[in-house]
Amino acid sequence: HTAAQDNCTCPTNKMTVCSPDGPGGRCQCRALGSGMAVDCSTLTSKCLLLKARMSAPKNARTLVRPSEHALVDNDGLYDPDCDPEGRFKARQCNQTSVCWCVNSVGVRRTDKGDLSLRCDELVRTHHILIDLRHRPTAGAFNHSDLDAELRRLFRERYRLHPKFVAAVHYEQPTIQIELRQNTSQKAAGDVDIGDAAYYFERDIKGESLFQGRGGLDLRVRGEPLQVERTLIYYLDEIPPKFSMKRLTA
């Protein structure tokens, strides 16, 4: 896997340990927590990043209406089980044998159960709605300039092809970025929208996952775009399965 040859670091993931022990003395980087080799020319999967985060010392840390099936990550951090490709396993369990099913971005999509709970497949999150509120500015941003800059950001910083940025909506001070990526659309080598959204979320929080690269400095025509609130909604190809008790709560 590629990494900076000279100082042997991983530009796309600072939560790695790198050493020149790859074939021919090439730099190879492994994710903290899992020890899995990562490809440093692209984003690391969210599952491996969450696992690394949980293993790290604790101090290292026209608007669209979301569909009724949209999920929000209310459960927060957990130590996930990842498959050999670094994807979330469909079933996640904690140390007390409480289990639940997750989607491809690792967000719970069923009620919690016990070890008998079955999660037949990893359901793909095909639509992500990133809802941002920006800090007050002298005037509203120009919508087309904002759209262009956000598309460029996802392309250049997160290597997400612009075709997966379905739309950028803006009603000051709310910005919504829609990412869409069906299973059939995602080709080998394409960055997953879930991984791009996670890197973006961490960037917005000032917790960049990139090694040596500056923090996120988002500007529209030279004017800084500073985000004060972020909410992310996840829509799966198959609607989630929660009991009526939760739905009416």
């Epitope: 020319s41 087309s144 262009a148 598309r151 092809h161």
Partner: antibody, heavy 118, light 109 residues
Amino acid sequence: QSLEESGGDLVQPGASLTLTCKASGFDLNNYSILWVRQAPGKGLEWIGSIYISGGSTYYANWAKGRFAISKTSSTTVTLQMTSLTAADTATYFCARDDGTASYYLNLWGPGTLVTVSS
Amino acid sequence: YDMTQTPASVSEPVGGTVTIKCQASEDIYKLLAWYQQKPGQPPKLLIYAASDLESGVPSRFKGRGSGTDYTLTISDLEAADAATYYCQQAYTIGNIDNSFGGGTEVVVK
């Protein structure tokens, strides 16, 4: 798959000109089209680009304000140039990215010559 | 993200080796391409991602580098390799003057 530029001409200083890039054999959507120029005996100079599906446009710092790229049909992209000077004399190429998130240009048109002279 | 390419011109005999250097003003994370251009023709993509060979390009062309420093090496030079070669940073199109290096003319004696 091919690209072809047209509209190159001999024009007076201060004039405006519109160049057209026509795509054949592939769907323009999901690609970016970039305009690059080359003055006689000089190197390549990036002018700007458009991401077709989203319509977003981007320009080199020196090209902002005087050059405008737009998609005019399902197969054509134009480059509008205003206030032309002798320094704009060049062969103008349109090129397509490779369909990835990077800007590697794997398909080029043959170019069209623009001469600005009185 | 200025791209500085050296040398401006180089001359080598058939069978020789040429190395062209390209330096970016900032880290471009291996997002670099090399193009070959012959007189009267548009540029042709040779190498992308700093070291990956475009389909149909002979393995005599070798790209390497990371960070800000990149090289293109052409070994076993052939007469057909006489051309001008350009590097291009493929990382960003934001707030730049040009994404291409100044070019290197390769003369094959």
